[in-house]
Every structure is written in C-alpha cells, then in structure tokens.
C-alpha cells in the first residue's frame, strides 16, 4: 500500500533526524498529503525557511559555527517581508548577528550562503555602515528608526539568528 510505505519512510526519516533535532513540527503543504514540510521545534517558519533565535552570546564566527552544526547558517535576509517576520521574535534591547560580513574591510559585503549582496535590498540604519574595521553586521532596534542593520566588530559577542531551508519528508 502506497500510503503505508510513505508513512513508514516518513517515520524513519523523523527518527533519523532526531539525532540532530529532537523534535520537528511538520505541516502538510498544499492538497497533497505526500508533502510535509518541517521545522525543528521551537524554530519558527516563514515561507520556505525555518528560523532560530540563539540567545547565547558569541562572536560572529562562533555564531555561524553554531548554526552550521544544526544544518543552518546565520540568517540571510532577502526581502522586507522576511525582515518584518524576523523582528517579531527579537527583543528590542538586544542585537543579533546576521549572515553578512565584509572580511576584507573593503565594503565588499557578502552573505554567508553566497547570495549576491544587493544594495537595493538592505536595511542599514542611517549612517551605517560607518567603520571599515567593523566587518560584521547585526540587526538591532533604534528608537528613532525602529529595526535596522549596523556594522560592528566581529569578535564582540552577540545573540544571533540562524536560518535553514524547511525539511521536507
């Protein structure tokens, strides 16, 4: 029976993934019972991605390593809608690393997943970025401008946001 074998395969996948993410929250996508999209619990989901707010304070490199161990990366923000979703889960008195850095200090910003950096889809606070030695980007809240990006020193510990594609089983 097709449905039975599909369910057995799905359960097997869920068991296999438990070693990385002990619990997954899955939803049926569309009309087809075959397609389940999952995010680890308690990650949040938006469109085809899952997001995790890491409250541990670490350097940018360690934050990225922490995300990659989970099969994710520091967040790459592609649209205003995506940023609007992300900020719903952030605390105003905290700053969070993004997956955006300028390793050479030459204002050649690059996303960790090689998504091309598009100047037209950036949300820097006014006057930012403003320091060639500050080579990593955070998102934070400023009362005058709400949420936006700022460049900071990469070694200064911050909270962070991880992003991964939804897991399809």
């Amino acid at each position: 029976n097709f449905m039975y074998s599909k369910t057995v395969k799905r359960l097997s996948k869920l068991r296999e993934y438990q070693q990385y993410h002990p619990s997954l929250t899955c939803v049926m996508e569309g009309k087809d019972i075959e397609d389940w999209s999952c995010c680890p619990t308690p990650w949040t989901s938006f469109q085809s991605s899952c997001y995790f707010i890491s409250t541990g304070m670490q350097s940018w490199t360690k934050s990225q390593k922490n995300c990659s161990v989970m099969g994710a990366d520091l967040v790459v923000i592609n649209t205003r809608e995506e940023q609007d979703f992300i900020i719903q889960n952030l605390k105003r008195n905290s700053s969070y690393f993004l997956g955006l850095s300028d390793p050479g200090g030459r204002r050649h910003w690059q996303w960790v997943d090689q998504t091309p950096y598009n100047e037209n889809v950036t949300f820097w606070h006014s006057g930012e970025p403003n320091n060639l030695d500050e080579r990593c980007a955070i998102i934070n809240f400023r009362s005058s401008e709400e949420w936006g990006w700022n460049d900071i020193h990469c070694h200064v510990p911050q909270k962070s946001i991880c992003k991964m594609k939804k897991i399809y089983i």
Epitope: Y20, S68, V69, D73, V112, Y168
Partner: nanobody, 127 residues
Framework: QVQLQESGGGLVQAGGSRRLSCAAS????????MGWFRQAPGKEREFVAA????????YLADSLKARFTISRDNAKNTVYLQIRSLNPEDTAVYYC????????????????????WGQGTQVTVSS
C-alpha cells in the same frame, strides 16, 4: 560530532594522478554534504569541490573542473577526490569538511558553512 580523516596525500610527479580519501565516523554520514578545500603555503584555504548527501549533485571550482572529480560511497562512509594531470600549483594541504544538510544541495563553497573538518593531507607535486 563527526570525525574526518583524510588519506592519500604524498609526493607526486607532475602530470601524475592521485585519489584522496576522507573517512567519516560519528554521526550518520548520509546526512552530511561533504566538501574538499585546499591550502597552499602562505595562501588562504580555497574551495575545491562539494558533493550532496546522496552524491547526485556535485559542485566544483571552475578552474579545477577539468581535472578534479568528487565522489562518495555512503556504504563506506567515505568521500573521494580524484585529481588528474597534477602540476606544482596543486601543491597544498587538502582538507575534507562536513556539513549537515537536509536536502540534496552541493552548493556549499564557503569554509564558514562547514561545521566539521579533518586534519588535512599534504600533496606535493614535483616538476
């Protein structure tokens, strides 16, 4: 944790071939995309090749495509890098790396995206 151990390096004559191996232990190998990087003396570590969890998808650095092949044997928990027509510019320490991946992508070209690394194997090409 994933442990990675490279082997197959050594001294090779220019024009020769070499197959590097990387044996993985620890977690379920089939859930990890694998990559090869290399680092020549005084240079930054550079991307060589990557392969998806199933082995169906591969991605190689443009400049190396013609001579390098990446493959994996999930039954043996091993990933391979076959190098042909070696030249002195290929002299480097070759590292293998693993990245947890829940899809079948091989587009992982940045060192930052790999959580686990081997110690490396030295390849020296003499002219």
């Amino acid at each position: 944790q994933v442990q990675l151990q490279e082997s197959g390096g050594g001294l090779v004559q220019a024009g020769g071939s070499r197959r590097l191996s990387c044996a993985a232990s620890g977690r379920t190998f089939i859930n990890y995309a694998m990559g090869w990087f290399r680092q020549a003396p005084g240079k930054e570590r550079e991307f060589v090749a990557a392969i998806s969890t199933s082995g169906s998808n591969t991605y190689l650095a443009d400049s190396l495509k013609a001579r390098f092949t990446i493959s994996r044997d999930n039954a043996k928990n091993t990933v391979y890098l076959q190098i042909r027509s070696l030249n002195p510019e290929d002299t480097a320490v070759y590292y293998c790396a693993a990245r947890l991946s829940f899809d079948d992508s091989a587009y992982y070209t940045s060192t930052l995206r790999y959580a686990y690394w081997g110690q490396g194997t030295q390849v020296t090409v003499s002219s």
